[in-house]
């Protein structure tokens, strides 16, 4: 035969925001300050996440849900639920263990995060460089040299080989 959960376990009647207090005959007690329970029937409340230092509070903790953090300006979130904060860099830079470093020649980064990536090699597509690349911007490829007027030519040097995520220091 099958009994309902509430008959087997009086704690199942305790709603979110409370816990089943064994010290008080298993009555439902509210979660203490700075703690929460997001589901019913819990025997303990979980400690609220603290957003301090590199983290700042995006959503306050309540009796039924944990606090949510994001990062203090100058840093950005990494990981599920913003589990880490990572330093921003300027465009044209990438983050290394030595801090933000300029992209080396032939590479670019157009964001405040991520690594410097090699400029597009236009010649691989049979095209020419229309606009040169910079540390912040990729090259712009134009028509193929054959499409240019007679006598005109454009030579695209190959992008330097580079291990992703590392700049020469």
């Amino acid at each position: 035969f099958e009994r309902t959960r509430s008959l087997q376990d009086p704690c199942s009647n305790c709603p979110a925001g409370t816990f089943c207090d064994n010290n008080r005959n298993q009555i439902c007690s509210p979660c203490p300050p700075n703690s929460f329970s997001s589901a019913g029937g819990q025997r303990t409340c979980d400690i609220c996440r603290q957003c301090k230092g590199v983290f700042r509070t995006r959503k306050e903790c309540s009796s039924t849900s944990n606090a949510e953090c994001d990062c203090t300006p100058g840093f950005h979130c990494l990981g599920a639920g913003c589990s880490m904060c990572e330093q921003d860099c300027k465009q044209g830079q990438e983050l290394t263990k030595k801090g933000c470093k300029d992209c080396c020649f032939g590479t670019f980064n157009d964001q405040k995060r991520g690594i410097c990536r090699p400029w597009t090699n236009c010649s691989l597509d049979g095209k020419s460089v229309l606009v040169n690349g910079t540390k912040e911007r990729d090259v712009v490829c134009g028509p193929s040299p054959a499409d240019l007027s007679p006598g005109a030519s454009s030579v695209t040097p190959p992008a330097p080989a580079r291990e992703p995520g590392h700049s020469p220091q």
Epitope: G53, V54, F75, L78, G79, S83, M84, C85, E86, Q87, L95, T96, K97, G165
Partner: nanobody
Framework: EVQLVESGGGLVQPGGSLRLSCAAS?????NYWMNWVRQAPGKGLEW???????????YYVDSVKGRFTISRDNAKNSLYLQMNSLRAEDTAVYYC????????????????SGQGTTVTVSS
């Protein structure tokens, strides 16, 4: 509970010195890269320095090179920042922060930091 607690801040005159400390608890300090970051009034957060697990690698933001020294004592579960030749622009709240798992390999994320200690440089 994993915790970092900073101390040692205060009011100091330009050219003076301070030594900040950070006491770590709830984890093994020697397993992690550690960092100091700071936030000046009305500004964003700025990375200051970091140090690897055994103290053999130390890096600094350009503005503090030659003036600040980061160090650690793993036996005492403590991180330090010796600040010399202090300038008005060093005025900030200073936080110690732990590099997350994989720091320096596939990210430079910080996963734990303290409440901060305030450094004011003024005459």
């Amino acid at each position: 509970e994993v915790q970092l607690v900073e101390s040692g801040g205060g009011l100091v005159q330009p050219g003076g010195s301070l030594r900040l400390s950070c006491a770590a608890s709830g984890f093994t300090l020697s397993n992690y890269w550690m960092n100091w970051v700071r936030q000046a009034p009305g500004k964003g957060l700025e990375w200051v320095a970091n140090i690897n697990q055994d103290g053999s690698e130390r890096y600094y933001v350009d503005s503090v090179k030659g003036r600040f020294t980061i160090s650690r004592d793993n036996a005492k579960n403590s991180l330090y920042l010796q600040m010399n030749s202090l300038r008005a622009e060093d005025t900030a709240v200073y936080y110690c922060a732990r590099g997350g798992e994989g720091y320096g390999v596939d990210h430079y994320g910080l996963d734990v930091s303290g409440q901060g200690t305030t450094v004011t440089v003024s005459s």
